[in-house]
């Protein structure tokens, strides 16, 4: 080995090249903190990067830098400290037009924290370890919200847009002419009838058992879907958020309501059976590998 | 295809009467919000010459009020305009539009459903 080599290697082993490191990265987090940062920051932050260069330097002159098994790009965790130094040169020396999205990248400093403490090192490994594994039961989850999907689909396809129409128009009015003419919330507050205080017209169905439309409304199929758009059931990939709304329970409740109102109370039995499997069963099945995943990580 | 079929158009001297007949007896009509009488004359624009509701309320075009009467029939899904005292103004081509929600089969569509077209003449 040469002098270079074996100093960088003493410098790397010693417990407090890991301590100055650990320091560093602490105090940058709290540099990268700070809302409005004088100009004296800038300096410090130069003085980080040197840090950080100086390290990767070491780690290369003692470990060699990709060729070897134990070189200093074949541990992942040395790819992050890579990435990390690589954006700290760019911002700083390359003009790039939108820095501030690049500027983002300076978060992954904190992230170099898990490559020097070695417990939060171990528990990282079970996350991926246990990421591996859950492969299996995402694509079970993935394939059970499709078929789901696919079901609420060819059910409530276009069924969302149902409302309640006023049954009084001007002489020169008909259906399509106002269709065309929608565009401004006042429009819709106009013709449709709205709930106090919903922000959506009031859903209603034209079969016997679905939401009926109050006296003097017709219940016509019109205009976009509630939530602003982003509640349906009309193409696959709107089908596929909404079952996921319903495995994760994210406010289903509303989306079943609005749903059973719309199609009729019988299709209740499709909600039964979508929480049951996907927010039960799937939900816990997930769970129960994570837990696994770590139990061996842990022997 | 969606298909309205008109009825009852015809010639008639002035000051007669005839009754036109607007039936959506395909199964494919589901609901209206109002189904109605329209007329063109001959170099003119399409106007309003009456309409009912689902709820049986009803609106009429002022050359038209207290001579035409529109009625409904829900069982038969048929809309009759009864036209009285008829006036050679009244000439034209008479449309019937069901504006409401069909069925295609696979899903609900809502829109302006029109009919061929009867002919009135009113002339002596």
């Known amino acids: 080995f040469s002098p270079l080599r074996r100093i960088s290697i003493k410098i790397l082993v010693h417990s407090l090249f890991s301590m100055l490191i650990m320091c560093t990265i602490l105090t940058n987090c709290i540099f990268m903190t700070m809302n409005n940062p004088p100009d004296w920051t800038k300096n410090v932050e130069y003085t980080f990067t040197g840090i950080y260069t100086f390290e990767s330097l070491v780690k290369i002159l003692a470990r060699g830098f990709c060729v070897g098994e134990f070189t200093f790009l074949r541990d992942p965790w040395n790819w992050l400290d890579f990435v990390v130094i690589v954006f700290a040169y760019l911002t700083e020396f390359v003009n790039l037009g939108n820095v501030s999205a690049l500027r983002t990248f300076r978060v992954l400093r904190a992230l170099k924290t898990i490559s020097v403490i070695p417990g939060l090192k171990t528990i990282v490994g079970a996350l991926i370890q246990s990421v591996k594994k859950l492969s299996d039961v995402m694509i079970l989850t993935v394939f059970c919200l499709s078929v789901f999907a696919l079901i609420g689909l060819q059910l409530f396809m276009g069924n969302l847009k149902h409302k309640c129409f006023r049954n009084s128009l001007e002489n020169n009015e008909t259906l399509e002419s106002i269709m065309n003419t929608l565009e401004s919330e006042e429009d819709f507050r106009k013709y449709f009838y709205y709930l106090e205080g919903s922000k959506d017209a009031l859903l209603c169905g034209f079969s016997t058992d679905s939401g009926q439309c109050p006296e003097g409304y017709t219940c016509v199929k019109i205009g976009r879907n509630p939530d602003y758009g982003y509640t349906s059931f009309d193409t696959f990939s709107w089908a596929f958020l909404a079952l996921f709304r319903l495995m994760t329970q994210d406010y289903w409740e509303n989306l079943y309501q609005q749903t059973l109102r719309a199609a009729g109370k019988t299709y209740m039995i499709f909600f039964v059976v979508v929480i049951f499997l996907g927010s039960f069963y799937l939900i816990n099945l997930i769970l129960a590998v994570v837990a696994m995943a770590y139990e061996e990580q842990n022997q | 295809e969606v298909q309205l079929v008109e009825s009852g158009g015809g010639v008639v001297q002035p000051g007669g009467s005839l009754r036109l007949s607007c039936a959506a007896s395909s199964r494919q009509f589901i609901r209206d919000v109002f189904t109605g009488w329209y007329r063109q004359a001959p170099g003119k624009q399409r106007e309003l010459v009456a309409r009912?509701?689902?709820?049986?309320?009803?609106q009429y075009a002022d050359s038209v009020k207290g001579r035409f009467t529109i009625s409904r029939d829900n069982a038969k899904k048929t809309v009759y305009l009864q036209m009285n005292s008829l006036r050679p103004e009244d000439t034209a081509l008479y449309y019937c539009?069901?504006?409401?929600?069909?069925?295609?089969?696979?899903?609900?569509?809502?829109?302006?459903?029109w009919g061929q077209g009867t002919l009135v003449t009113v002339s002596s």
């Open positions: 539009l069901f504006s409401g929600t069909i069925s295609t089969g696979r899903e609900y569509r809502s829109g302006d459903y």
């Open positions: 009912i509701y689902n709820e049986g309320n009803t």
